[in-house]
């Protein structure tokens, strides 16, 4: 996926990521020799972010917008190295695949598992979350399923509208030229699903939708 490609455009940064970067720089200036307790620093940053006014956040949102434009501009001209043609072009403006009920559940309880077991590997955290989900009563799973269904419905509408508008040139030309078998295509979509969920996991949830899903 172009991991080792130095020419690959740097990923776009969210407004929160710009804010954290600024926080880090400020901290370094004030305490040049102090080592940073990452979890404490992250917590302080997130608390500060939550209390910031829309006006204060505006500066970082502008930075994120500019960075998104830069990323899209660079991605249009970026040609992946030869061996990387398997990955099809991913339009940054395309609607994001919706999270599953389990993924929504994981987003809720991952911080607790990580916080209570700081030494746990990603795999073990996932295992614990899987166990939690399996032990969750159907009735308690229902709100997550409802929310996931709502998000899926929204995604389907968005993707239909997006496709109707027509994909951008780069996507039309397509990095993938050969006609793939249906099976291979499905495999790729599944893979993309997983990647999208991993990406979502890494993104800060500062603009998390607080849908009140009544049971």
């Amino acid at each position: 996926m172009g991991k080792g490609d130095p020419k690959k455009p740097r990923g776009k940064m969210s407004s929160y990521a710009f804010f954290v970067q600024t926080c880090r720089e400020e901290h370094k200036k004030k305490h040049p020799d102090a080592s940073v307790n990452f979890s404490e620093f992250s917590k302080k940053c997130s608390e500060r972010w939550k209390t910031m006014s829309a006006k204060e956040k505006g500066k970082f949102e502008d930075m994120a917008k500019a960075d998104k434009a830069r990323y899209e501009r660079e991605m249009k001209t970026y040609i992946p190295p030869k061996g990387e043609t398997k990955k099809k072009f991913k339009d940054p403006n395309a609607p994001k695949r919706p999270p599953s009920a389990f993924f929504l559940f994981c987003s809720e309880y991952r911080p607790k598992i990580k916080g209570e077991h700081p030494g746990l590997s990603i795999g073990d955290v996932a295992k614990k979350l899987g166990e939690m989900w399996n032990n969750t009563a159907a009735d308690d799973k229902q709100p997550y399923e409802k929310k996931a269904a709502k998000l899926k419905e929204k995604y389907e509408k968005d993707i239909a509208a997006y496709r109707a508008k027509g994909k951008p040139d780069a996507a039309k030309k397509g990095v993938v030229k050969a006609e793939k078998s249906k099976k291979k295509k499905e495999e790729e979509e599944d893979e993309e699903d997983e990647e999208d969920e991993e990406e979502e996991e890494d993104e800060e949830d500062e603009d998390e939708e607080e849908d009140d899903d009544d049971e």
Epitope: L104, S107, E108, Y109, P111, K112, G115, E116, K128, E131, M132, W133, N134, N135, T136, A137, A138, D139, D140, P143, Y144, K147, D205, E208, E209, E210, D211, D212, D213, D214, E215
Partner: antibody
Framework: EVQLLESGGGLVQPGGSLRLSCAAS????????MVWVRQAPGKGLEWVSS????????IYADSVKGRFTISRDNSKNTLYLQMNSLRAEDTAVYYC??????????????WGQGTLVTVSS | DIQMTQSPLSLPVTPGEPASISCRSS???????????LDWYLQRPGQSPQLLIY???NRASGVPDRFSGSGSGTDFTLKISRVEAEDVGVYYC????????FGQGTKVEIK
């Protein structure tokens, strides 16, 4: 030490509104699902509402659906219950409780001291 | 909705003697994972409820070992091996398999 402290109870007329708060301390509030449970005078316990750690999913008992709203502010370590269109049968001591998920099996491991809501004309 | 029925509703006890409270549910509380989604709470006079037993038979931390929970499916029992004066109050069972429902409570008082 885990502490939950409810406030905001009082006397209110039928049809009126009230907002209860529950201040949490001694634990990482944003990790836990929280609930409101009530107890009418001389009666048993009744679960009212639940909210997941992020606040993104809320669940209500049929008796309060459409009238009560549970919410939380993780930056303030506070749980809320906005009660509208109050009825005489909502008169009760309201408790907030923390939900412990023992590998997905839930139970209420800490309770506040309760705040009394009286709905009467 | 799952209904919870406790018996007896009132239980006069003698300190040092055993005591037993029954809780019945209208549907099985046994999850596919083999655990029962039933907890026991005690509300001492003038106090908030406190957790005693979770998942049918697991004693909560700090709860004396004279308290034990047993049963499966629809029939559950809370036993106090030797009642002490501080055990007086109202005992509630609660199911968490479908929403949350409490039993009507059993009032334990010294004879």
């Amino acid at each position: 030490e885990v502490q939950l402290l409810e406030s905001g109870g009082g006397l209110v007329q039928p049809g009126g509104s009230l907002r209860l708060s529950c201040a949490a301390s001694g634990f990482t509030f944003s990790w836990y699902k929280m609930v409101w449970v009530r107890q009418a005078p001389g009666k048993g316990l009744e679960w009212v509402s639940s909210i997941v750690p992020s606040g993104g999913i809320t669940i209500y008992a049929d008796s309060v659906k459409g009238r009560f709203t549970i919410s939380r502010d993780n930056s303030k370590n506070t749980l809320y219950l906005q009660m509208n269109s109050l009825r005489a049968e909502d008169t009760a001591v309201y408790y907030c409780a923390r939900v412990q998920q023992w590998l997905g099996r839930p139970y209420f491991d800490y309770w506040g001291q309760g705040t009394l809501v009286t709905v009467s004309s | 909705d799952i209904q919870m029925t406790q018996s007896p509703l009132s239980l006069p006890v003698t300190p040092g003697e055993p005591a037993s409270i029954s809780c019945r549910s209208s549907q099985s509380l046994l999850h596919g994972n083999g655990y029962n989604y039933l907890d026991w709470y005690l509300q001492r006079p003038g106090q908030s409820p406190q957790l005693l037993i979770y998942s049918g038979s697991n004693r909560a931390s700090g709860v004396p070992d004279r308290f034990s929970g047993s049963g499966s499916g629809t029939d559950f029992t809370l036993k106090i091996s030797r009642v002490e004066a501080e055990d007086v109050g109202v005992y509630y069972c609660m199911q968490s398999l479908q929403s949350r429902t409490f039993g009507q409570g059993t009032k334990v008082e010294i004879k």
